[in-house]
Amino acid sequence: AAIGSCSKEYRVLLGQLQKQTDLMQDTSRLLDPYIRIQGLDVPKLREHCRERPGAFPSEETLRGLGRRGFLQTLNATLGCVLHRLADLEQRLPKAQDLERSGLNIEDLEKLQMARPNILGLRNNIYCMAQLLDNSDTAEPTKAGRGASQPPTPTPASDAFQRKLEGCRFLHGYHRFMHSVGRVFSKWGESPNRSRR
C-alpha cells in the first residue's frame, strides 16, 4: 500500500507483507551489493561475514509471540535497522568514487532503496496492527522481548573492521527477514484466525 494509506482487506495486506518480507530476505538486494562495494567479495573475507548470534530476535522467539506482539517486535526491530542503515549509508563511497574505481553504481542504488522499502513495510505493519485491533477477537498480546537491540556495533578498530561489522549486520538482517517471512506464511486466511 502507498505510504500513509491502509488497505482494509486483510488478505491484500497480508499478501503485501509477505511480498515485502520475501524481497527483503533476498541478499542480492542489500548484502551482496554491500559486499561488492566494500571490497569484501573474496571467499576468505566472506567467511567473516556471519552474523553474531542474538543480534536479532530468533525465529523461535517470533513464533512464540501473538500476532500483535509479533508486529510490535518487528516494528521495533525495523526501527533499529533503519538507524543502523543510515549509519552504514554515511560510510559508503560516493557515486563518482564508485565510477572511478570501476564498481557498479546499481549496487549503490540498491543499498539506497533499502530504507524506503523498510518504511513501506512499516506502513503495512501499522495497517495490519490497526486491522487486527478492529477485528472481533482480541488475542492476548504476549509481549515481545522487544527487538533484542540490533547491532550495537562493537567499537571498530579501523575502517576494515567497520566494514565487517556492517556485513555481519546485513547478514543478520536478511536472516531475520527470512524468519519474519516464515511467520507471516503461517498466518491464517482471516484476521480472526492464526495457524500456528
Epitope: 500500500a1 502507498a2 505510504i3 494509506s5 488497505s7 482494509k8 482487506e9 488478505r11 491484500v12 497480508l14 499478501g15 503485501q16 509477505q18 511480498k19 515485502q20 520475501d22 524481497l23 513501506g120 507471516f184 506464511s185 491464517g188 486466511e189 482471516s190
Partner: antibody, heavy 120, light 106 residues
C-alpha cells in the same frame, strides 16, 4: 508440468446460469490460490475472484452477487458458477494461478481460456 | 479502486528498436506487474515486483518505476515481441489491470 485447462463455456441466454471448470495439474489447489480473470472481446483484462489454498474467497465487488467461486480439492478442480448472466458478461474466462502459497494477487500460470457468449 | 492508465495506446516500431511502455496509477502502488498477450493466447507474466524478470523471460525486457509511474522497456525488439502488454497492481483491492498497449510492427 503446471497446467490449467478451462471448460464449460458456450452460448447461453441472458438471465440463465453457467458453471465453468478449471482442471489443475502439476500442482495442488491446497497449496496455491487460483483466480478467475476475464476478457471481453477486444477489451482488457478484469479480475473476477480468487479462492485461496485454505478455501476462503475474495470477489471483485462487481460480480459478488452473481458469481460464486469454489473448488474440489479431491479433483484438483476450480469452478465459477455464474448466475443471471447478462450480455456484458460475454468474455473469455481464464483461470490463473498465484505464484506461491502466500496471498499473492498476481498470476504466473494461465489457462488458455473458455469463451462465454451471452446472447438471445 | 486504482485505475491504471497505459500509454501510448498503440506503439509502432521496427525490430531492433527500443520500446518504452508506460503505466500510471490513480494512486501510488508498491509494485507493478507486466504481462504480454498475443492474439488468441492467454497472457504471460513478464515482470514481477516492478523489476524482476519472470521465469524464462529474456533479458531484453526490463521494468522500473515507483509510486504512480512505472515503465516496461524492451531494449532490442524481436519479431515475437509484437503483442499487447498489460500492467497490473494489487497494492489496493481489487487487483486491476491497465487497458493495454498494443505494440505493432511499423
Amino acid at each position: 508440468q503446471v497446467q490449467l485447462v478451462e471448460s464449460g463455456g458456450g452460448v447461453v441466454q441472458p438471465g440463465r446460469s453457467l458453471r465453468l471448470s478449471c482442471a489443475a495439474s502439476g500442482f495442488s489447489l491446497t497449496n496455491y490460490g487460483v483466480h478467475w480473470v476475464r476478457q471481453a472481446p477486444g477489451k482488457g483484462l478484469e479480475w473476477v475472484a480468487v479462492i485461496w489454498r485454505g478455501g476462503s474467497t475474495d470477489y471483485n465487488a462487481a460480480f459478488m452477487s452473481r458469481f460464486t467461486i469454489s473448488k474440489d480439492n479431491s479433483k484438483n478442480t476450480l469452478y465459477l458458477q455464474m448466475n443471471s448472466l447478462r450480455a456484458e458478461d460475454t468474455a473469455v474466462y481464464y483461470c490463473a494461478k498465484s505464484p506461491n502459497s502466500n496471498f499473492y494477487w498476481y498470476f504466473d500460470v494461465w489457462g488458455r481460456g473458455t469463451l462465454v457468449t451471452v446472447s438471445s | 479502486e486504482i485505475v491504471l492508465t497505459q500509454s501510448p495506446a498503440t506503439l509502432s516500431l521496427s525490430p531492433g528498436e527500443r520500446a518504452t511502455l508506460s503505466c500510471s496509477g490513480s494512486s501510488s502502488v508498491s509494485y507493478m506487474y507486466w504481462y504480454q498477450q498475443k492474439p488468441g493466447q492467454a497472457p504471460r507474466l513478464l515482470i514481477e515486483d516492478t523489476s524482476n524478470l519472470a521465469s524464462g523471460i529474456p533479458a531484453r525486457f526490463s521494468g522500473s518505476g515507483s509510486g504512480t509511474d512505472y515503465t516496461l522497456t524492451i531494449s532490442n525488439l524481436e519479431p515475437e515481441d509484437f503483442a499487447v502488454y498489460y500492467c497490473q497492481q494489487w497494492s489496493s483491492y481489487p487487483p486491476t489491470f491497465g487497458q493495454g498497449t498494443k505494440l505493432e510492427i511499423k
